[in-house]
């Protein structure tokens, strides 16, 4: 028998520095977690204690904090090289700055293979990107070899900016021939490493013949066997065992997100490359693990540029940006409109001639808007200003919901109106009329939504049975502020870009902004 230790991360999302327990900014260092300096210490401890160790990343290193905003991926290459990762799969967020934003800072600088079998380049890009990412890589590990085959969510064109010269194929269809190729090369231990979410990970384990282990990402899935060490609730045991169509037991793993845990999976193979046993658990990277002092010093050196950036002007406002709770928790506020407009703008993807865009709607809990911005400071808007408005380090995500769920959400928005509660919704691509004289649960008297399958966008009544795409904060997607119906009834959820980054990019693009209160949210009494 031959044992392999797989260490894995996924959806790190720019958390290079240690964070608080909820993966936001570290406040009390003695209780902080994760970060590359701490990860380095743990990885090195395992590498010197165990014989056959692979360190793998399942994508979405890009996007999530000011580190990515400023360094644009150079920080990912630098610190992943320092950690001596063995391989990485491309995630959807690796395309957030376009293909060039992937090629230059990461693909050309990484000292480890970057993989995806289901992304095919065409046209002029094919020769430019050739060899910079690979469908698979055979890695020597001790006296053996292990094949790693990569995959990426085929939804990436709707979630990021890969451009028109990359084709995202079905994962299973693309993986099978690559695995078959590895088999012909006498590679009998094969790991599928990818970024399509837990459901697809399980399907790959079930359907792709020859895959021994699946290491996934995208869905931020936390798996654990035994008593979990922090706040995350396990979605299943670690590893999650799938019985493949050809009768094998295939371990599937994922390690939550944000670098909070290091996935740790031990696999025992027989001489023919069959998995005999698998066990492990994610390791919580808490403060009992010291941060490596050299890596920490390097982080602090790179940090200097971030502090400078946060006070630089992004753009100007010529109007007061009303983000006060007195406005945003009671009525349409122009800060809410600005943020929603930025959210939609960030999700412009012309992927189909029938649609002007794949999504037109935004909802945003008023309680998530934490500060106004005064225009009487020469109109200047800085990252620091936006961090006061959006201090929670969330993301603006893409969900699919039925019209009936949206209706429930808008009823919830005003079910206890007047108490300055955070669930009052700000909107974009939606016209809503409330009648507060009616009883809670029956106050939405008009709900019109902007069409997507149209050449001239216009507002049409919401259809209860239709499925709509909506951009919203991850806080709402996770049922925050009492929006349990969103969490329970959403049909799809893809995590998006850092909230501040979305708004700052929009302001930089627009240069001068002047959002108005324009009748997106109205109140009426009596008949309609």
């Amino acid at each position: 028998a031959w044992e392999l230790t797989i260490l894995h991360t996924n959806d790190v999302h720019s958390r290079l520095e240690q964070t608080s327990e909820d993966s936001s900014k570290c406040v009390n260092a003695s209780r902080c977690m994760g970060g590359v300096a701490r990860l380095f210490t743990k990885v090195q401890q395992i590498r010197r204690a165990e014989p056959n160790v692979l360190l793998l990343d399942a994508g979405d290193q890009y996007q999530g904090t000011i580190w990515f905003t400023v360094y644009k991926g150079a920080e990912v290459a630098h610190f992943m090289n320092a950690l001596r990762y063995d391989a990485m799969a491309l995630g959807n967020h690796e395309f957030d700055n376009g293909v060039e934003g992937l090629i230059e800072p990461l693909l050309k600088e990484a000292k480890f293979p970057i993989l995806s079998a289901n992304i095919k380049a065409k046209g002029p890009l094919a020769s430019q990107i050739s060899g910079l990412y690979l469908p698979y890589k055979v890695l020597p590990v001790g006296d053996e070899v292990v094949g790693i085959v990569g995959y990426t969510s085929k939804e990436t064109p709707f979630l990021s900016n890969p451009g028109t010269n990359l084709v995202f194929e079905d994962e299973i269809t693309a993986l099978q021939p690559e695995v078959d190729k590895l088999k012909t090369l006498n590679v009998n231990k094969i790991i599928a490493l990818g970024h399509s979410g837990f459901e697809m990970d399980k399907l790959i384990a079930q359907k792709v013949r020859g895959v021994d282990v699946v290491v996934g990402g995208h869905s931020n899935t936390f798996l654990y066997t035994g008593n979990p060490p922090s706040k995350e609730v396990p979605a299943g045991k670690y590893p999650f065992i799938v019985t493949s169509d050809d009768g094998r037991k295939v371990p599937v793993v994922q390690a939550y997100a944000f670098g909070k845990y290091l996935g740790y999976l031990k696999i025992e193979f027989d001489e023919r490359g069959n998995v005999i046993s698998s066990h492990g658990n994610p390791i919580l990277l808490n403060s009992s693990i010291p941060e490596d002092p050299s890596i920490k010093a390097d982080i602090n050196k790179w940090r200097i540029k971030l502090d400078n950036y946060s006070t630089q002007e992004l753009g100007k406002t010529i109007v007061y940006l009303d983000g006060s709770s007195q406005s945003c928790r009671f009525r349409e506020c122009n800060m809410g409109n600005l943020i929603c407009d930025a959210m939609i703008n960030n999700n412009l993807r012309h992927t189909d001639e029938m649609f002007w865009n794949h999504v037109s709607m935004c909802i945003l809990n008023g309680g998530g808007i934490r500060s106004p911005i005064d225009e009487r400071n020469n109109g200047t808007i800085t990252w620091e200003n936006l961090a006061a408005v959006l201090p929670f380090g969330g993301t603006f995500d893409l969900v699919q919901l039925k019209g009936s769920t949206l209706k429930k959400a808008f009823e919830h928005s005003v079910h206890r109106y007047g108490q300055s509660t955070g669930e009052f919704l700000q909107v974009g691509g939606i016209h809503v009329v409330y009648d507060l004289s009616r009883k809670p649960g029956d106050r939405v008297v008009k709900l019109d939504v902007l069409c997507t399958k149209c050449r001239v966008p216009s507002y049409d009544p919401l259809k209860m049975d239709e499925v709509y795409k909506v951009i919203l904060p991850n806080f709402l997607a996770n049922g925050g502020d009492g929006f349990q119906m969103i969490k329970d009834e959403l049909l799809r959820h893809d995590s998006g870009d850092q909230d501040i980054n979305v708004v700052s990019t929009y302001i930089s693009k627009m240069k001068v902004i002047y959002p108005a209160v324009e009748g997106r949210i109205k109140f009426s009494t009596g008949s309609h």
């Epitope: 090195q44 204690a49 658990n281 009992s288 010291p290 890596i295």
Partner: antibody, heavy 117, light 113 residues
Framework: EVQLQQSGPELVKPGASVKISCKAS????????MNWVKQSHGKSLEWIGN????????NYNQKFKGKATLTVDKSSSTASMELRSLTSEDSAVYYC??????????WGQGTTLTVSS | DIVMTQSPSSLTVTAGEKVTMSCKSS????????????LTWYQQKPGQPPKVLIY???TRESGVPDRFTGSGSGTDFTLTISSVQAEDLAVYYC?????????FGGGTNLEIK
């Protein structure tokens, strides 16, 4: 204060087996791998193997595979090493040592094993 | 496995003298990630377990007198005792702490005249 308290000296006959224990205190037992090191009289240090107290996973120096078996009891924070089919070559001082993040931080006081008929 | 070779195997010095001992590894112990050499020096006094003196080739463990200095990089390392004291009578071992499996040098036995 971190301490690794090893069991006392052993005098055993050739062909027999022996089990040496190492009780840990003063730290979280599952945080660090436990190593075992052999030192024959007047000789250098030889790494035998290690065990991960979290899950009982072991790694052995090829030379000691079949000779040594490492186990842990998490409930009592005790690591043990069994040596079997003993010969005079196995006469030595055996140390347990936990490997922290940078080196073998703490060592037991050593257990002297004498194999003699 | 990485082979560690120490020299000399023994040396005898007078108290107050400066002493240097060498350790060579068959492969580099430099971790490119943090630019640290994962080499540890241990001191073993008669009848005692080994005790860490120096880690990362040159970082003195807390409580270790500053007369002990570690240096070197890659495959060649040195332990220097600037002014030997009677209590330094011991065997000094170097260890590869970089990659699996951990391996020790044969030791340098320091005797005091």
């Amino acid at each position: 204060e971190v301490q690794l308290q090893q069991s006392g000296p052993e005098l055993v006959k050739p062909g027999a087996s022996v089990k040496i224990s190492c009780k840990a205190s003063g730290y979280t037992f599952t945080d660090y791998y436990m190593n075992w090191v052999k030192q024959s009289h007047g000789k250098s240090l030889e790494w035998i193997g290690n065990i991960n107290p979290n899950n009982g996973d072991t790694n052995y120096n090829q030379k000691f595979k079949g000779k040594a078996t490492l186990t842990v009891d998490k409930s009592s924070s005790t690591a043990s090493m069994e040596l079997r089919s003993l010969t005079s070559e196995d006469s030595a001082v055996y140390y347990c040592a936990n490997s922290g993040y940078y080196y073998f931080d703490y060592w037991g006081q050593g257990t002297t094993l004498t194999v003699s008929s | 496995d990485i082979v560690m070779t120490q020299s000399p195997s023994s040396l005898t010095v007078t108290a107050g003298e400066k002493v240097t001992m060498s350790c060579k590894s068959s492969q580099s112990l430099l971790n490119s990630g943090n630019q640290k050499n994962y080499l540890t020096w241990y001191q073993q006094k008669p009848g005692q377990p080994p005790k860490v003196l120096i880690y990362w080739a040159s970082t003195r463990e807390s409580g270790v007198p500053d007369r002990f200095t570690g240096s070197g990089s890659g495959t060649d390392f040195t332990l220097t005792i600037s002014s030997v004291q009677a209590e330094d009578l011991a065997v000094y071992y170097c260890q590869n702490d970089y990659s699996y499996p951990p391996t020790f040098g044969g030791g340098t036995n320091l005797e005091i005249k």
